[in-house]
């Protein structure tokens, strides 16, 4: 039995991959910020989790993906006031009683210390410092990524 | 209420440097990205460039060369400096509150008349 | 970056009539990031819609956008006398952020 959050996930998920392929994203487009081979994107304004994935797929990108401690730290850098907490895209699943990221893969363990449960209706955030599992319906800001294509330099055999 | 206030010299002699600064109140600087836009006498609007709270800044590829975004969180300002200026750059200076792809530029200071004269 | 152009440059109706406003694009307007402001003489000019269609707070629903790509449009349906202003298409989408030239609507 998937819960509403994770069927809005899959939906969301499958309909980003039903689009047409865009060419590869060179550059980060205006308000982005690049950051190593991503560009992201910091709402102002507050939204429950699901709101959340909603908009940043209207942007044609995904709530922010975080691959390992190391990114984790790199975009805690960007965030400068202390206060202020950021949705990505991890979510509980009920179903598999594990953090699941909204590409479908499991959270590893040793990736994030989340403070706070890992439970029914239950996000996880970001600040400054931290990470927080927080209740879905929540409402604070949030973090887009769109992956830049890595431009290839062309290697020409000696003249 | 979002209030911006315009605050600098009203006249510029050319090939100096241009300072204007921006003070907002109403809302925290800490978000949104801050921008400047200047129109000429008579003439239509031009983007300068924005700056994100945490430094991060985007200037129009026309004025790159010469211009210089900066924020202070604490004073909840920001500010431009425009260099080596001309008689071209003669204009009223707009700061504005933009909040990128969500809503453009919601918020924006009356306006201060630079002129470039010698 | 992208020309925005206004047309026409200037349009002359009475209060009570539906003024039509063009905005054309040089490229395809990003996820129809553009904006519309009015600006009158001596003040700094207001929002009134963006993403090519939402009003932005407090502006009264006779102002109305729409179209996508590269054309676009601002409606407002029955002139105020306080709506005789210079109207601004700006797009938001694409780096440098650009205006159109501006259209002014005054009173025939």
């Known amino acids: 039995q998937k819960s509403s959050i994770e069927k809005c996930s899959v939906d969301i998920q499958q309909s980003r991959n039903k689009t047409t392929e865009r060419p590869g994203l060179l550059n980060c487009p205006i308000y982005w910020q690049q950051l190593r081979e991503k560009c992201l994107l910091f709402s102002h304004t507050v939204n429950p989790w699901n709101n959340s994935l909603a908009d940043c797929s209207t942007k044609e990108s995904s709530l922010l993906l975080i691959r390992d401690k190391d990114e984790l730290i790199h975009t805690q850098n960007l965030i400068r006031d202390k206060a202020i907490l950021f949705w990505i895209g991890l979510n509980f699943s009920l179903s598999e009683k594990n953090w699941k990221w909204i590409n479908g893969s499991f959270l590893n363990s040793n990736d994030l210390e989340i403070r706070g449960d890992a439970k029914e209706n239950s996000c996880i955030s970001i600040s400054q410092t931290s990470v927080y599992s927080e209740y879905c319906s929540t409402e604070i800001r949030w973090i887009c990524q769109k992956e830049l294509t890595p431009v290839r330099n062309k290697v020409y055999p000696d003249s | 209420q979002v209030q911006l206030q315009e605050s600098g010299p009203g006249l510029v002699q050319p090939s100096e440097t241009l300072s204007l600064t921006c003070t907002v109140s109403?809302?925290?600087?800490?978000?949104?990205?801050w921008s400047w836009i200047r129109q000429p006498p008579g003439k239509g609007l031009e983007w300068i460039g924005y700056?994100?709270?945490?430094?991060?800044?985007n200037y129009n590829p026309s004025l790159k060369s010469r211009v210089t975004l900066s924020v202070d969180t604490s004073k909840n300002q920001f500010s431009l400096k425009v260099r080596s200026v001309t008689a071209a750059d003669t204009a009223v200076y707009y700061c504005?509150?933009?909040?990128?792809?969500?809503?453009?530029?919601?918020?924006w200071g009356q306006g201060t008349l630079v002129t470039v004269s010698s | 970056e992208i020309v925005l152009t206004q047309s026409p440059g200037t349009l002359s109706l009475s209060p009570g009539e539906r003024a039509t406003l063009s905005c054309r694009a040089s490229?395809?307007?990003?996820?129809?990031?553009l904006a519309w402001y009015q600006q009158k003489p001596g003040q700094a000019p207001r929002l009134l819609i963006y993403?090519?269609?939402s009003r932005a707070t407090g502006i009264p629903d006779r102002f109305s956008g729409s179209g996508s790509g590269t054309d676009f449009t601002l409606t407002i349906s029955r002139l105020e006398p306080e709506d005789f202003a210079v109207y601004y298409c700006?797009?938001?989408?694409?780096?440098?952020?650009?205006f159109g030239q501006g259209t002014k609507v005054e009173i025939k």
């Open positions: 504005a509150r933009d909040s990128g792809p969500w809503v453009p530029l919601d918020y």
């Open positions: 700006q797009q938001y989408g694409s780096s440098p952020p650009t």
């Open positions: 109403g809302s925290s600087i800490s978000s949104y990205y």
């Open positions: 700056i994100y709270y945490n430094g991060n800044t």
């Open positions: 993403g090519a269609s």
């Open positions: 490229q395809s307007v990003s996820s129809s990031y």
